[in-house]
């Protein structure tokens, strides 16, 4: 429990006075917050938060999903917390299977435990397959398992959280990691033809091909020295993972002399931008 200097507001005090509490499923959770300026209890689990204005928090029959952090706050905005594990042998994990990782960043596999006293909390590949050799992770029973520095090669990796309970390995439900690639180069852009010579009234159509690692690449056709929004049509394909192609087709159904000029296909991603131009000359 917190120690205080006289005269200064102090954080609330919680009974039982420990940072973690383990209760069995079906048992009672009883938490008392003592503070003259008590405001509320906040209960934060994986999925949502709840509030309680009573200074005693009672859950008569604890369930695994009552596992989480209980925080008592006073009128000074000071708080104190206790983490409650509701031990349920039938429900060792509280999984959220939405799992996205940004390349080169860490990502959390959300499978917090309901029992911190199980052993060998780790990740395992599905169907007995080994995990990639370079996959590193850090387990945290209250949050889940953090995968360090996600690699592009981990895309669509199937894995389970795993613990040993009474000598047996217990697996969570399946998680499938979806990796969003980091842009490490500018998009590759090309144009179907570098210049066009047309008669008035003929159709002008030009296609720009944009290639990048994901559909997050931005592209547009622009007319040089003009802000006018050009009408374009898109087709796109994923040629396997991290090999995305878009075709942006610009069409002027009946070209006029004053449509002559330079048209630029511009593409950008978070790494940088690229462009390619085509010249249209319309004659009488």
């Amino acid at each position: 429990q917190p120690s205080v200097s006289p005269g200064e507001p102090s954080p609330p005090s919680i009974h039982p006075g420990k940072s973690d509490l383990i209760v069995r499923v079906g048992d009672e959770i009883r938490l008392l917050c003592t503070d003259p300026g008590f405001v509320k209890w906040t209960f934060e689990i994986l999925d949502e938060t709840n509030e309680n204005k009573q200074n005693e928090w009672i859950t008569e029959k604890a369930e695994a999903t009552n596992t989480g952090k209980y925080t008592c706050t006073n009128k000074h905005g000071l708080s104190n917390s206790i983490y409650v594990f509701v031990r349920d042998p039938a429900k060792l994990f509280l999984p959220d299977r939405s799992l996205y990782g940004k390349e080169d960043n860490d990502t959390l596999v959300r499978c917090p435990l309901t029992d911190p006293e199980v052993t060998n909390y780790s990740l395992k590949g599905c169907q007995g397959k080994p995990l990639p050799k370079d996959l590193r992770f850090i387990p945290d029973p209250k949050a889940g398992i953090m995968i360090k520095s996600v690699k592009r090669a981990y895309h669509r990796l199937c894995l389970h959280c795993s613990v040993d309970q009474e000598g047996k390995s217990v697996l969570s439900e399946k998680f499938i990691l979806k990796v969003r690639p980091a842009f490490k180069a500018v998009p590759v852009v090309s144009v179907s033809k570098a210049s066009y010579l047309l008669r008035e009234g003929e159709e002008f159509t030009v296609t720009c091909t944009i290639k990048d690692v994901s559909s997050s690449v931005y592209s547009t056709w622009k007319r040089e020295n003009s802000q006018t929004k050009l009408q374009e049509k898109y087709n796109s394909w994923h040629h396997g993972d991290f090999n995305y192609e878009r075709q942006a087709t610009l069409t002027i159904s009946s070209a006029r002399v004053n449509d002559s000029g330079v048209f630029m296909c511009y593409a950008n991603n978070t790494f940088g931008s690229a462009n390619v131009t085509t010249t249209l000359e319309v004659v009488d």
Epitope: E44, L46, D47, E48, T49, N50, P95, D96, R97, S98, Y100, K102, N105, C126, Q127, R156, C158, K174, I176, R180, S215, S216, H238
Partner: antibody, heavy 117, light 111 residues
Framework: QVQLQQPGAELVKPGASVKMSCKAS????????MHWVKQTPGQGLEWIGV????????SYNQKFKGKATLTADKSSSTAYMQINSLTSEDSAVYYC??????????WGQGTLVTVSA | NIVLTQSPASLAVSLGLRATISCRAS??????????MHWYQQKPGQPPKLLIY???NLESGVPARFSGSGSRTDFTLTIDPVEADDAATYYC?????????FGGGTKLEIK
């Protein structure tokens, strides 16, 4: 419980832009991805994009790239979507939806955007 | 883009009987046996409400009259028996691949 609050309606002029909000409560805002969905009688439900929890990265449906911009303010637990260069085709109901355990488990009530001169 | 085709576009079912709605994907939405297909119910003036997730899992609070089945490209939502309150439009949705897509919807009328 989990709530996503959206303003009921926005009336905007063609060519203008609109920024709509989605205020989240009842959960830890920074732990969940927020998606945006457009609904029109003609096109049905269309996924616009997602703002990812924590780092604020975004991913868009190419159809809405350059048209919609997704942002979030962690301090107020509010997600925003701005739509620019509005035309009559942008008149629709726009929903925010929280992704939980692979699915859209919670939806806002929707904002009706009407584009009219 | 993965295209989801729902059929029928509308159907009328008598109270107490079974309603079956189909959703066909233009390519598989499965990874390692997980089908990233979900079903929603929408009533006029309301947002969609999740009924079934990952093809066959009943969302908490949804009556057991609703069930989902299928894998890869072919999925089915079944309501048995149908009740008056089930009159609504039903949508399938995939989030296996960006961009996430929805089916065109099936309007259910109760006779």
């Amino acid at each position: 419980q989990v709530q996503l609050q959206q303003p009921g309606a926005e009336l905007v002029k063609p060519g203008a832009s609109v920024k709509m909000s989605c205020k989240a409560s009842g959960y830890t805002f920074t732990s969940y991805n927020m998606h945006w969905v457009k609904q029109t009688p003609g096109q049905g439900l269309e996924w616009i994009g997602v703002i990812y929890s924590g780092n604020g990265d975004t991913s868009y449906n190419q159809k809405f790239k350059g048209k919609a911009t997704l942002t979030a303010d962690k301090s107020s637990s509010t997600a925003y979507m701005q739509i620019n260069s509005l035309t009559s085709e942008d008149s629709a109901v726009y929903y925010c939806a929280r992704e939980r355990d692979t699915r859209f488990g919670n939806w806002g009530q929707g904002t009706l955007v009407t584009v009219s001169a | 883009n993965i295209v989801l085709t729902q059929s029928p576009a509308s159907l009328a079912v008598s109270l107490g009987l079974r309603a079956t709605i189909s959703c066909r994907a233009s390519e598989s939405v499965d990874i390692y046996g997980n089908s990233f297909m979900h079903w929603y119910q929408q009533k006029p003036g309301q947002p969609p409400k999740l009924l079934i997730y990952l093809a066959s899992n009943l969302e908490s609070g949804v009556p057991a009259r609703f069930s989902g089945s299928g894998s890869r490209t072919d999925f089915t939502l079944t309501i048995d028996p149908v009740e008056a309150d089930d009159a609504a439009t039903y949508y399938c949705q995939q989030n296996n691949e960006d961009p996430y897509t929805f089916g065109g919807g099936t309007k259910l009328e109760i006779k």
